[in-house]
């Protein structure tokens, strides 16, 4: 799978994680920090 950094316009899209662009899937994806979930890593779980 080809991966690159998201465009600058997506800075701040992932609240608690890193935005990566999955080239083959044409999708932005939030790689969440430990303890966070959700499309934008917006939910905290214990």
């Amino acid at each position: 799978v080809s991966i690159t950094k998201c465009n600058s316009d997506m800075n701040g899209y992932c609240l608690h994680g890193q935005c990566i662009y999955l080239v083959d899937m044409s999708q932005n994806y939030c790689r969440c920090e430990v303890g966070y979930t959700g499309v934008r890593c917006e939910h905290f779980y214990l």
């Epitope: 465009n7 316009d9 899209y13 609240l15 662009y21 044409s26 499309v39 934008r40 917006e42």
Partner: antibody, heavy 116, light 106 residues
Framework: QDQLVQSGAEVKNPGASVKVSCKAS????????IQWVRQAPGQGLEWMGR????????KYREKFEGRVTITADTSTNTAYMELSSLRSEDTAVYYC?????????WGQGTLVTVSS | DIQMTQSPSSLSASVGDRVTITCRAS??????IAWYQQKPGQAPRLLIQ???TLQPGVPSRFSGSGSGTDYTFTISSLQPEDIATYYC????????FGGGTKVEIK
Amino acid sequence: QDQLVQSGAEVKNPGASVKVSCKASGFNIKDTYIQWVRQAPGQGLEWMGRIDPLRRQTKYREKFEGRVTITADTSTNTAYMELSSLRSEDTAVYYCVRSGREFDFWGQGTLVTVSS
Amino acid sequence: DIQMTQSPSSLSASVGDRVTITCRASQDIHKYIAWYQQKPGQAPRLLIQYTSTLQPGVPSRFSGSGSGTDYTFTISSLQPEDIATYYCLQYEQLRTFGGGTKVEIK
């Protein structure tokens, strides 16, 4: 399936304001950014601004700053674009556009006519 | 703001011709460019995103290339149904459309 349904055509007098709505279904606007783009008759496409409904953060094109207000109501899954101090040059089709995880998905457009 | 300079603004070509449209960004947009087709009275239709990724259902005669600040959109063999206006869009930093290219048949 995912949809963006915009409000109907409007006719406004010069100097008035217009508020166009964009209701999302099939997805949560909090997972996206909502952009607004307009196109005057016979002219090109022009990006106006966008909102991040989750953070309630807006960014506007400089030329519209102070005249456009983009808002979102996450309880009804609806975004809004209000343009004030209307002039004849604002006659255009206004589109809302979803961006975020996937690339852009457009609403059907709303024609706003400014005429006295 | 990033500026997008699209050229030519209009062109006339014969059916079967190769058609090329260029967009130049005022700074590096890291391949974050899309190409739209718009026919009169219709909303824009996305053809290509991320420089060269063709959307599902878009004919393979459409292609895109480029990097840095210079990008190209190509129709390898112009068809009558390709008569439209084409726009580039940079989405690296916010969004900026090119001025459009009206494609007509000779």
